[in-house]
Protein backbone atom coordinates (compact mmCIF):
# COMPACT_ATOMS: atom_id res chain seq x y z
CA UNK A 1 0.00 0.00 0.00
CA UNK A 2 0.81 3.32 -0.54
CA UNK A 3 0.56 4.53 2.97
CA UNK A 4 2.36 6.83 5.23
CA UNK A 5 4.10 3.51 6.60
CA UNK A 6 5.72 2.93 3.27
CA UNK A 7 6.79 5.93 1.93
CA UNK A 8 7.85 7.66 4.78
CA UNK A 9 10.36 4.94 4.91
CA UNK A 10 11.67 4.90 1.56
CA UNK A 11 12.71 7.03 -1.26
CA UNK A 12 10.43 6.51 -3.39
CA UNK A 13 9.92 8.35 -6.94
CA UNK A 14 6.80 7.19 -8.11
CA UNK A 15 3.43 7.93 -6.54
CA UNK A 16 3.89 7.93 -2.77
CA UNK A 17 1.85 10.02 0.06
CA UNK A 18 4.25 12.80 1.10
CA UNK A 19 4.85 14.93 4.36
CA UNK A 20 3.23 17.88 4.53
CA UNK A 21 3.22 20.20 7.35
CA UNK A 22 0.66 23.33 7.09
CA UNK A 23 0.56 25.74 9.60
CA UNK A 24 -3.30 27.19 9.91
CA UNK A 25 -2.30 30.89 10.07
CA UNK A 26 0.83 31.32 7.96
CA UNK A 27 -0.18 29.13 5.22
CA UNK A 28 -3.90 29.47 5.12
CA UNK A 29 -4.71 32.67 6.95
CA UNK A 30 -7.22 30.35 8.62
CA UNK A 31 -7.56 32.66 12.08
CA UNK A 32 -10.79 30.64 13.23
CA UNK A 33 -8.76 27.49 14.36
CA UNK A 34 -7.22 28.24 17.83
CA UNK A 35 -5.91 24.70 18.07
CA UNK A 36 -3.99 22.44 16.75
CA UNK A 37 -1.84 25.55 15.13
CA UNK A 38 -0.86 23.47 12.37
CA UNK A 39 -1.55 19.64 11.58
CA UNK A 40 0.36 17.46 8.81
CA UNK A 41 -2.22 16.94 5.82
CA UNK A 42 -0.01 15.30 3.75
CA UNK A 43 -0.06 15.04 -0.20
CA UNK A 44 0.32 12.84 -3.39
CA UNK A 45 2.95 13.12 -5.87
CA UNK A 46 4.66 11.13 -8.31
CA UNK A 47 4.07 9.69 -11.48
CA UNK A 48 1.93 6.60 -12.32
CA UNK A 49 3.74 4.05 -14.12
CA UNK A 50 1.83 1.09 -15.94
CA UNK A 51 -0.24 -0.89 -12.99
CA UNK A 52 1.17 1.22 -10.33
CA UNK A 53 -1.61 1.17 -7.77
CA UNK A 54 -4.68 1.52 -10.54
CA UNK A 55 -7.44 2.99 -8.83
CA UNK A 56 -9.76 1.48 -11.75
CA UNK A 57 -10.01 -0.34 -15.15
CA UNK A 58 -9.81 3.15 -16.83
CA UNK A 59 -6.62 3.91 -14.45
CA UNK A 60 -5.59 0.50 -16.08
CA UNK A 61 -6.04 1.36 -19.84
CA UNK A 62 -4.81 5.01 -19.43
CA UNK A 63 -1.56 3.58 -17.45
CA UNK A 64 -0.88 1.19 -19.97
CA UNK A 65 -1.83 3.40 -23.10
CA UNK A 66 0.53 6.61 -21.52
CA UNK A 67 3.58 3.48 -21.36
CA UNK A 68 2.69 2.11 -24.97
CA UNK A 69 2.14 6.05 -26.12
CA UNK A 70 4.64 7.97 -23.93
CA UNK A 71 3.93 11.31 -25.99
CA UNK A 72 0.31 11.47 -24.84
CA UNK A 73 -0.63 13.92 -22.21
CA UNK A 74 -3.18 11.60 -20.72
CA UNK A 75 -1.88 9.51 -17.80
CA UNK A 76 -3.07 8.59 -14.59
CA UNK A 77 -2.63 10.71 -11.57
CA UNK A 78 -1.45 10.18 -7.95
CA UNK A 79 -4.61 11.30 -5.68
CA UNK A 80 -5.25 10.58 -1.89
CA UNK A 81 -7.15 7.16 -1.42
CA UNK A 82 -7.42 7.03 2.61
CA UNK A 83 -8.16 10.01 4.61
CA UNK A 84 -8.61 10.56 8.17
CA UNK A 85 -9.50 13.76 10.33
CA UNK A 86 -9.10 16.09 12.84
CA UNK A 87 -10.33 17.63 15.55
CA UNK A 88 -10.54 21.60 16.22
CA UNK A 89 -10.63 23.99 18.60
CA UNK A 90 -12.81 27.03 17.72
CA UNK A 91 -14.88 29.75 19.24
CA UNK A 92 -18.23 31.46 18.64
CA UNK A 93 -17.81 34.85 20.20
CA UNK A 94 -15.99 33.71 23.62
CA UNK A 95 -17.69 30.16 23.41
CA UNK A 96 -14.90 27.50 22.91
CA UNK A 97 -16.28 24.52 20.62
CA UNK A 98 -14.62 21.20 18.90
CA UNK A 99 -15.77 20.03 15.70
CA UNK A 100 -13.59 17.02 13.73
CA UNK A 101 -13.29 18.29 10.07
CA UNK A 102 -13.26 15.26 8.13
CA UNK A 103 -11.13 13.69 5.47
CA UNK A 104 -8.09 16.34 6.02
CA UNK A 105 -4.98 13.87 6.82
CA UNK A 106 -4.04 12.07 3.34
CA UNK A 107 -2.79 8.42 4.87
CA UNK A 108 -2.56 6.77 1.45
CA UNK A 109 -2.67 7.39 -2.51
CA UNK A 110 -3.78 5.57 -5.18
CA UNK A 111 -3.18 6.30 -9.00
CA UNK A 112 -6.59 7.61 -11.01
CA UNK B 1 -20.21 19.92 -13.42
CA UNK B 2 -17.07 18.83 -14.87
CA UNK B 3 -18.72 16.21 -16.94
CA UNK B 4 -18.62 15.90 -20.83
CA UNK B 5 -21.65 18.35 -21.44
CA UNK B 6 -19.80 20.93 -20.08
CA UNK B 7 -16.34 19.82 -20.93
CA UNK B 8 -16.27 19.16 -24.72
CA UNK B 9 -18.68 22.31 -25.57
CA UNK B 10 -16.23 24.35 -23.64
CA UNK B 11 -12.46 25.92 -24.48
CA UNK B 12 -11.65 25.08 -20.21
CA UNK B 13 -7.88 25.47 -19.55
CA UNK B 14 -9.14 24.13 -15.62
CA UNK B 15 -9.61 20.63 -14.81
CA UNK B 16 -12.15 19.09 -17.33
CA UNK B 17 -12.78 15.54 -18.58
CA UNK B 18 -11.15 15.65 -22.77
CA UNK B 19 -11.84 13.04 -24.83
CA UNK B 20 -9.58 9.59 -26.01
CA UNK B 21 -10.01 7.36 -28.09
CA UNK B 22 -8.39 4.13 -27.77
CA UNK B 23 -8.06 1.82 -30.35
CA UNK B 24 -7.55 -1.76 -28.26
CA UNK B 25 -5.21 -3.39 -30.73
CA UNK B 26 -3.22 0.11 -31.79
CA UNK B 27 -3.01 1.82 -28.70
CA UNK B 28 -3.14 -1.15 -25.51
CA UNK B 29 -1.84 -4.40 -27.94
CA UNK B 30 -5.23 -5.78 -26.69
CA UNK B 31 -5.97 -8.59 -29.67
CA UNK B 32 -8.43 -10.58 -27.16
CA UNK B 33 -11.28 -7.51 -28.11
CA UNK B 34 -13.08 -8.37 -30.65
CA UNK B 35 -15.93 -5.51 -30.73
CA UNK B 36 -16.09 -2.82 -29.98
CA UNK B 37 -12.83 -2.07 -31.76
CA UNK B 38 -11.92 0.99 -29.73
CA UNK B 39 -13.98 3.25 -27.51
CA UNK B 40 -13.91 6.64 -26.09
CA UNK B 41 -12.57 6.14 -22.78
CA UNK B 42 -11.66 9.63 -22.14
CA UNK B 43 -9.60 11.51 -19.81
CA UNK B 44 -8.90 14.28 -16.95
CA UNK B 45 -6.54 17.22 -17.08
CA UNK B 46 -6.22 20.87 -16.22
CA UNK B 47 -5.16 22.69 -13.34
CA UNK B 48 -7.31 22.63 -10.11
CA UNK B 49 -7.71 26.41 -8.65
CA UNK B 50 -8.56 26.93 -5.50
CA UNK B 51 -12.13 25.43 -5.15
CA UNK B 52 -13.07 24.01 -8.26
CA UNK B 53 -14.79 21.27 -8.07
CA UNK B 54 -12.84 19.99 -4.96
CA UNK B 55 -13.45 16.43 -3.89
CA UNK B 56 -12.90 16.78 0.17
CA UNK B 57 -11.44 19.48 2.57
CA UNK B 58 -8.21 18.28 2.11
CA UNK B 59 -8.21 19.29 -1.70
CA UNK B 60 -10.04 22.64 -0.71
CA UNK B 61 -6.90 23.10 1.82
CA UNK B 62 -4.11 22.20 -0.52
CA UNK B 63 -5.82 24.44 -3.52
CA UNK B 64 -5.76 27.35 -0.78
CA UNK B 65 -2.42 26.09 0.16
CA UNK B 66 -1.33 26.11 -3.62
CA UNK B 67 -3.05 29.24 -4.28
CA UNK B 68 -0.65 31.10 -0.76
CA UNK B 69 2.43 29.47 -1.41
CA UNK B 70 2.53 29.29 -5.48
CA UNK B 71 6.43 27.68 -5.35
CA UNK B 72 5.06 24.79 -3.28
CA UNK B 73 4.93 21.46 -4.76
CA UNK B 74 1.64 20.33 -3.45
CA UNK B 75 -1.24 20.74 -5.40
CA UNK B 76 -4.58 19.04 -5.83
CA UNK B 77 -4.83 17.22 -9.23
CA UNK B 78 -8.35 16.55 -11.73
CA UNK B 79 -9.04 13.04 -11.50
CA UNK B 80 -12.41 10.96 -12.87
CA UNK B 81 -15.21 11.27 -10.83
CA UNK B 82 -18.00 9.12 -12.81
CA UNK B 83 -17.25 6.06 -14.63
CA UNK B 84 -19.36 4.26 -16.68
CA UNK B 85 -19.22 0.40 -18.19
CA UNK B 86 -17.93 -0.63 -21.40
CA UNK B 87 -19.65 -3.63 -22.80
CA UNK B 88 -17.13 -6.11 -25.10
CA UNK B 89 -17.31 -8.76 -26.79
CA UNK B 90 -14.32 -11.47 -26.34
CA UNK B 91 -13.64 -15.27 -27.33
CA UNK B 92 -12.69 -18.74 -25.36
CA UNK B 93 -11.52 -20.44 -28.16
CA UNK B 94 -14.04 -20.10 -30.39
CA UNK B 95 -17.14 -19.31 -28.07
CA UNK B 96 -18.44 -16.08 -27.81
CA UNK B 97 -18.60 -13.94 -24.98
CA UNK B 98 -19.91 -10.93 -23.52
CA UNK B 99 -18.55 -8.85 -20.72
CA UNK B 100 -19.55 -5.75 -18.96
CA UNK B 101 -16.10 -3.86 -17.65
CA UNK B 102 -16.74 -1.55 -14.83
CA UNK B 103 -15.04 2.05 -14.63
CA UNK B 104 -14.07 2.08 -17.94
CA UNK B 105 -15.30 5.80 -19.87
CA UNK B 106 -14.84 8.93 -17.99
CA UNK B 107 -18.14 11.10 -18.02
CA UNK B 108 -16.64 13.65 -15.44
CA UNK B 109 -13.78 14.94 -13.07
CA UNK B 110 -12.98 16.28 -9.76
CA UNK B 111 -10.29 17.95 -8.21
CA UNK B 112 -8.72 15.37 -5.70
CA UNK C 1 -14.24 39.99 -4.83
CA UNK C 2 -15.62 39.88 -0.99
CA UNK C 3 -17.63 43.35 -0.40
CA UNK C 4 -19.75 43.61 2.62
CA UNK C 5 -22.31 46.62 2.47
CA UNK C 6 -24.78 47.88 5.53
CA UNK C 7 -27.68 49.42 5.41
CA UNK C 8 -30.62 49.94 7.70
CA UNK C 9 -29.26 52.72 10.14
CA UNK C 10 -30.87 56.23 11.32
CA UNK C 11 -32.24 58.42 13.92
CA UNK C 12 -34.56 56.39 16.47
CA UNK C 13 -36.15 57.55 20.03
CA UNK C 14 -34.70 55.76 23.10
CA UNK C 15 -36.75 52.15 23.16
CA UNK C 16 -36.98 51.95 20.06
CA UNK C 17 -36.25 49.31 17.02
CA UNK C 18 -33.73 49.03 14.40
CA UNK C 19 -32.85 46.49 12.14
CA UNK C 20 -29.68 46.40 10.44
CA UNK C 21 -28.31 44.79 7.04
CA UNK C 22 -24.94 43.39 6.23
CA UNK C 23 -25.47 42.09 2.34
CA UNK C 24 -22.60 39.93 1.83
CA UNK C 25 -20.65 38.75 -1.57
CA UNK C 26 -17.69 37.13 -2.59
CA UNK C 27 -17.91 34.23 0.19
CA UNK C 28 -18.08 30.49 -0.62
CA UNK C 29 -21.32 29.38 -0.24
CA UNK C 30 -22.76 29.26 3.06
CA UNK C 31 -19.31 29.68 4.63
CA UNK C 32 -17.71 32.53 6.34
CA UNK C 33 -18.13 34.52 9.83
CA UNK C 34 -20.09 37.97 10.13
CA UNK C 35 -19.45 40.38 13.12
CA UNK C 36 -21.75 43.32 14.25
CA UNK C 37 -19.37 45.96 15.34
CA UNK C 38 -19.80 49.44 16.53
CA UNK C 39 -17.47 52.48 17.33
CA UNK C 40 -19.05 55.48 19.29
CA UNK C 41 -17.37 59.52 19.24
CA UNK C 42 -13.93 58.83 20.81
CA UNK C 43 -14.25 55.51 21.85
CA UNK C 44 -12.78 52.32 20.16
CA UNK C 45 -14.68 49.49 18.28
CA UNK C 46 -16.50 47.27 20.37
CA UNK C 47 -17.41 43.46 19.01
CA UNK C 48 -21.35 42.95 19.68
CA UNK C 49 -22.03 39.76 18.55
CA UNK C 50 -21.34 37.39 15.37
CA UNK C 51 -22.54 34.59 13.64
CA UNK C 52 -21.18 31.74 11.37
CA UNK C 53 -22.94 31.62 8.14
CA UNK C 54 -22.54 27.71 7.62
CA UNK C 55 -24.74 26.67 10.93
CA UNK C 56 -25.84 29.53 12.20
CA UNK C 57 -24.34 29.40 15.29
CA UNK C 58 -24.48 33.03 17.14
CA UNK C 59 -22.60 34.75 19.99
CA UNK C 60 -23.92 38.36 21.90
CA UNK C 61 -22.12 40.56 24.03
CA UNK C 62 -22.82 40.75 27.39
CA UNK C 63 -23.61 44.78 26.78
CA UNK C 64 -26.61 43.86 24.00
CA UNK C 65 -27.68 40.30 25.18
CA UNK C 66 -31.12 40.22 25.20
CA UNK C 67 -31.56 43.26 23.19
CA UNK C 68 -29.71 42.49 19.94
CA UNK C 69 -30.34 39.65 18.13
CA UNK C 70 -28.04 38.42 14.73
CA UNK C 71 -29.28 36.09 12.52
CA UNK C 72 -28.71 35.42 8.71
CA UNK C 73 -30.32 34.28 5.42
CA UNK C 74 -28.12 32.58 3.39
CA UNK C 75 -30.19 32.85 0.22
CA UNK C 76 -30.43 36.58 0.00
CA UNK C 77 -26.39 36.26 1.32
CA UNK C 78 -27.39 38.81 4.35
CA UNK C 79 -26.82 39.25 8.19
CA UNK C 80 -29.29 41.46 10.25
CA UNK C 81 -28.47 42.78 13.80
CA UNK C 82 -31.91 43.27 15.37
CA UNK C 83 -31.92 45.79 17.69
CA UNK C 84 -34.75 46.22 20.33
CA UNK C 85 -34.79 48.66 23.38
CA UNK C 86 -32.33 50.95 22.07
CA UNK C 87 -30.58 53.24 24.80
CA UNK C 88 -28.73 56.25 24.02
CA UNK C 89 -25.24 54.47 24.56
CA UNK C 90 -25.95 52.47 21.33
CA UNK C 91 -25.75 55.28 19.23
CA UNK C 92 -22.80 55.13 17.24
CA UNK C 93 -21.58 54.02 13.43
CA UNK C 94 -21.98 50.44 13.15
CA UNK C 95 -20.32 48.02 10.83
CA UNK C 96 -20.29 44.73 9.66
CA UNK C 97 -16.97 42.42 9.16
CA UNK C 98 -16.13 39.34 7.18
CA UNK C 99 -13.41 36.63 7.53
CA UNK C 100 -14.98 34.15 4.67
CA UNK C 101 -12.18 31.36 5.30
CA UNK C 102 -14.11 30.60 8.32
CA UNK C 103 -15.80 27.09 7.77
CA UNK C 104 -16.88 26.94 11.72
CA UNK C 105 -17.19 29.61 14.86
CA UNK C 106 -17.20 33.42 14.07
CA UNK C 107 -14.81 36.00 16.51
CA UNK C 108 -15.61 38.58 18.54
CA UNK C 109 -12.38 40.70 17.89
CA UNK C 110 -11.83 42.77 15.01
CA UNK C 111 -8.52 42.22 14.26
CA UNK C 112 -10.01 38.54 13.20
CA UNK C 113 -11.96 40.10 10.46
CA UNK C 114 -10.29 41.15 6.98
CA UNK C 115 -13.18 42.66 5.16
CA UNK C 116 -15.02 45.78 6.47
CA UNK C 117 -18.65 47.58 5.18
CA UNK C 118 -18.49 51.04 5.22
CA UNK C 119 -20.95 51.98 8.28
CA UNK C 120 -24.28 52.93 9.02
CA UNK C 121 -24.82 55.58 11.61
CA UNK C 122 -27.57 54.89 14.42
CA UNK C 123 -28.47 57.54 16.49
CA UNK C 124 -30.22 57.45 19.35
CA UNK C 125 -32.14 60.77 21.09
CA UNK C 126 -35.36 61.98 21.91
Known amino acids: ALDTNYCFRNLEENCCVRPLYIDFRQDLGWKWVHEPKGYYANFCSGPCPYLRSADTTHSTVLGLYNTLNPEASASPCCVPQDLEPLTILYYVGRTPKVEQLSNMVVKSCKCS | ALDTNYCFRNLEENCCVRPLYIDFRQDLGWKWVHEPKGYYANFCSGPCPYLRSADTTHSTVLGLYNTLNPEASASPCCVPQDLEPLTILYYVGRTPKVEQLSNMVVKSCKCS | EVQLVESGGGEVRPGGSLRLSCVVS????????IGWFRQAPGQEREGLGC????????WSADSVKGRFTISRDNVRNTVYLQMNALKPEDRGVYYC???????????????????WGQGTQVTVSS
Open chain 3, 51 to 58: IARKDGDT
Open chain 3, 26 to 33: GFTKDYGA
Open chain 3, 97 to 115: AGDPSALYGCSDRSSEYQY
